[in-house]
């Protein structure tokens, strides 16, 4: 059977050209966005940055797996990036976009 | 056909007896923990409380679904509960446990 790895951060480089955003984003050309994936299975160890609720949900899932899902693997720390882009009036704008880069993942 | 509902909060009452915790937790007997479940599919509307990263990840998933998963539905707001319990020395303790109740969910 497929045994997914435990919840963790995976590397992902996102190219703005691939997203079709190259006409309005001047710089950067892309960025290391990363993503979270993996199992949040019992027992939730310290690496999994689990909330108290996630711990409770995991125990309830084990008792009642048909109705209550496992917690999911989601970002716990996100960073911003600065983007240079054209606005609707073709002005060049430098803006900081929050919550763009995954720095850490956990079970939520 | 499989049409999973969009990411949202679901009601869940957790009984401490069901968890086998009745011998050390005096009160409450249980609590409304709730949980998050549902799809984080394109387009991520305002109800889904999506982060910028989740929006980017959704677009990357559409391009490359085998490699990058959809964002997951996780708590965005959590509340504490107060618990009266026996410690290891049989002292009665009142403690506030953080992040025990899901108040809102979103795509992360």
């Amino acid at each position: 059977s497929e045994l997914k790895t435990a919840c963790k951060k995976h590397e992902l480089y996102v190219s703005f050209q691939d997203l079709g955003w190259q006409d309005w984003i001047i710089a950067p050309k892309g960025y290391a966005a990363n993503y979270c994936d993996g199992e949040c299975s019992f027992p939730l160890n310290a690496h999994m940055n689990a909330t108290n609720h996630a711990i409770v949900q995991t125990l309830v899932h084990l008792m009642n797996p048909e109705y209550v899902p496992k917690p999911c693997c989601a970002p716990t720390k996100l960073n911003a990036i600065s983007v240079l882009y054209f606005d609707d009036n073709s002005n060049v704008i430098l803006k900081k976009y929050r919550n763009m880069v995954v720095r850490a993942c956990g079970c939520h | 056909s499989e049409l999973k509902t969009a990411c949202k909060k679901h009601e869940l009452y957790v009984s401490f007896q069901d968890l086998g915790w009745q011998d050390w937790i005096i009160a409450p007997k249980g609590y409304a923990a709730n949980y998050c479940d549902g799809e984080c599919s394109f387009p991520l509307n305002a109800h889904m409380n999506a982060t910028n990263h989740a929006i980017v990840q959704t677009l990357v998933h559409l391009m490359n679904p085998e490699y990058v998963p959809k964002p997951c539905c996780a708590p965005t707001k959590l509340n504490a509960i107060s618990v009266l319990y026996f410690d290891d020395n049989s002292n009665v303790i009142l403690k506030k446990y953080r992040n025990m109740v899901v108040r809102a969910c979103g795509c992360h």
Partner: antibody
Framework: QVQLVESGGGLVKPGGSLRLSCAAS????????VHWVRQAPGKGLEWVGR??????????AYAASVKGRFTISRDDSKNTLYLQMNSLKTEDTAVYYC????????????WGQGTLVTVSS | QSVLTQPPSVSGAPGQRVTISCTGS?????????VHWYQQLPGTAPKLLIY???ERPSGVPDRFSGSKSGTSASLAITGLQAEDEADYYC???????????FGGGTKLTVLG
């Protein structure tokens, strides 16, 4: 009282198709996860697959032995569960049961009486 | 080959105690999932006997009890009666995709 009644079984040739139904009554069918379980003559119970409730988006899952050949669906307005069986093989010969999953501990608390499917040339 | 392993048969005299084991692995019982037990009398559909590893549905006599430890579970029947002669199945979940798994079944024979 809770009742599950299967129908649609019978004799079918290898490669053929059959659709089983499971009529539910005595409970709010739409709120429950329901499964198909089969039992070959003189053998043990074998899980076939399940469909979740409306809250969980009717998501389905199947045993490896039937994946791609069998399809589970449900019509909550008719309180009925279905099992569409295609490309049937002789090893699919069995009594097919539908079973309801109780909501607190996920046990199969109610079963139908079963319907016999015989795949033979 | 079933995912959960049960002895094919057990037997006991009326009034005796018998136990039926159910051995799994780290991806099912060992992952923490509950175990349920079903009784199947000859020619009938299975019936839920023990749920949540150790709880009895209403109407099930307290002669039946269940327990779970590590990667195994067991069903105990005390004060064996002739009407207990049946097939018994354990059931749990596989953690990778939360799919149902059954034991191969155990035939209980009440002697004499």
């Amino acid at each position: 009282q809770v009742q599950l009644v299967e129908s649609g079984g019978g004799l079918v040739k290898p490669g053929g198709s059959l659709r089983l139904s499971c009529a539910a009554s005595g409970f709010t069918f739409s709120s429950y996860v329901v499964h198909w379980v089969r039992q070959a003559p003189g053998k043990g119970l074998e899980w076939v697959g399940r469909i979740k409730d409306h809250k969980q988006g009717y998501t389905t899952a199947y045993a490896a032995s039937v994946k791609g050949r069998f399809t589970i669906s449900r019509d909550d307005s008719k309180n009925t569960l279905y099992l569409q069986m295609n490309s049937l093989k002789t090893e699919d010969t069995a009594v097919y049961y539908c079973a309801r999953v109780e909501r607190s501990k996920s046990g199969f608390d109610n079963w139908g009486q079963g319907t016999l499917v015989t795949v033979s040339s | 080959q079933s995912v959960l392993t049960q002895p094919p048969s057990v037997s006991g005299a009326p009034g005796q105690r018998v136990t039926i084991s159910c051995t799994g692995s780290s991806s099912n019982i060992g992952a923490g999932y509950s175990v349920h037990w079903y009784q199947q009398l000859p020619g009938t559909a299975p019936k839920l006997l023990i749920y949540g590893s150790s709880e009895r549905p209403s109407g099930v006599p307290d002669r039946f009890s269940g327990s779970k430890s590590g990667t195994s579970a067991s069903l105990a029947i005390t004060g064996l009666q002739a009407e207990d002669e049946a097939d018994y199945y354990c059931q749990s979940w596989d953690s990778s995709q939360t799919l149902v798994v059954f034991g191969g079944g155990t035939k209980l024979t009440v002697l004499g």
